[in-house]
């Protein structure tokens, strides 16, 4: 099939006092090969400081996956989710408040 770019969605949730968990989800992409990781100041976090989801079919002939990490509240600007798929790349910021969700479709 042809290449389908992912929809990337970054969310945040309270983890513990002063910390938040940030989760980056990529969905609706094809083929299944994807790079999805958290960067701190543009530098990838060590693998053992991120939690990873498997790349799974989402039922539409496309795939989905996620990656999460914990950060200090107030330091959201330092962190971005980096995505690379089929030769295209993008970076996605952490939304500034709990109620905000960022959805980006990349071509």
């Amino acid at each position: 099939g042809s290449t389908v770019p992912p929809m990337v969605n970054v969310t945040r949730s309270e983890a513990s006092e002063g910390n938040i968990t940030v989760t980056c989800r990529a969905s609706g992409f094809y083929p299944w090969n994807i790079t999805l990781s958290w960067r701190q100041d543009g530098v990838s976090l060590s693998h053992d400081t991120q939690q990873w989801g498997d790349v799974l079919p989402d039922g539409n002939g496309t795939y989905q996956t996620w990656v999460a990490t914990r950060i200090c509240q107030g330091e959201e600007q330092r962190f971005t989710c980096y995505m690379e798929h089929s030769g295209n790349h993008s970076t996605h910021p952490v939304p500034s408040g709990n109620s905000h969700h960022h959805h980006h479709h990349h071509h």
């Epitope: 701190q40 100041d41 543009g42 530098v43 053992d48 950060i71 790349h89 910021p93």
Partner: antibody, heavy 118, light 112 residues
Framework: EIQLQQSGPELVKPGASVKVSCTAS????????IYWVKQSHGKSLEWIGY????????ISNQKFTGRATLTVDKSSSTAYLHLNSLTSEDSAVYYC???????????WGAGTTVTVSS | DILMTQTPLSLPVSLGDQASISCRSS???????????LEWYLQKPGQSPKLLIY???NRFSGVPDRFSGSGSGTDFTLKISRVEAEDLGVYYC?????????FGSGTKVEIK
């Protein structure tokens, strides 16, 4: 080959401003942040700040806030450090640098010497 | 700001000696998620610094295995197992776990 080419030396008067450029080649410019580091003569290194060329977002050392402005021109793969209200304390070598997968300053420019003198 | 204190400031060595440089941070540089952004750089006269070690103990591409990094929390060490002439210069530790990122004051490795 990944390279960061910096602009030439500058001699400027106190109170004036200067714009140092850093042109990247050998990689996709928007994939990696550009960092700026100051080194005064015979002294240690000082981190000024960084810019994400993809989003234009910046994070700076508070010490340089309001004095240093970081910008990029994606069309020419060039990052700029603009310093204003210069004093003799700003006389230094200014480096741009690029991170890699898991490290901060894997590639450095050759440095730009800025001399502030009347 | 996190202060990075390097010792010694000057390290006279004979070629073939082992050299050890200490770097102590004024507070822990282990980030909330466990990441520790501690790096070591070598700067030779008239040159840009060059990366040796990243994330405490990982050697950068092309760096000889006589260089090793270790430590955790606030105490970090760079060791050179057998100093060669090309290793002479000023060594800097650097932390990027917390803003503003800070460098140590440098350790000059020179011939005795």
């Amino acid at each position: 080959e990944i390279q960061l080419q910096q602009s030439g030396p500058e001699l400027v008067k106190p109170g004036a401003s200067v714009k140092v450029s850093c042109t990247a080649s050998g990689y996709a410019f928007t994939k990696y942040n550009i960092y700026w580091v100051k080194q005064s003569h015979g002294k240690s290194l000082e981190w000024i700040g960084y810019i994400d060329p993809y989003t234009g977002g910046t994070i700076s050392n508070q010490k340089f806030t309001g004095r240093a402005t970081l910008t990029v021109d994606k069309s020419s793969s060039t990052a700029y450090l603009h310093l204003n209200s210069l004093t003799s304390e700003d006389s230094a070598v200014y480096y741009c640098a690029r991170p890699g997968s898991y490290w901060y300053f894997g590639v450095w420019g050759a440095g730009t010497t800025v001399t502030v003198s009347s | 700001d996190i202060l990075m204190t390097q010792t010694p400031l000057s390290l006279p060595v004979s070629l073939g000696d082992q050299a050890s440089i200490s770097c102590r941070s004024s507070q822990s540089i282990v980030y909330t998620n466990g990441n520790t952004n501690l790096e070591w750089y070598l700067q030779k006269p008239g040159q840009s610094p060059k990366l040796l070690i990243y994330k405490v103990s990982n050697r950068f591409s092309g760096v000889p295995d006589r260089f090793s990094g270790s430590g955790s929390g606030t105490d970090f060490t760079l060791k050179i197992s057998r100093v060669e002439a090309e290793d002479l210069g000023v060594y800097y530790c650097f932390q990027a776990s917390y803003v503003p990122f800070t460098f140590g004051s440098g350790t000059k490795v020179e011939i005795k």
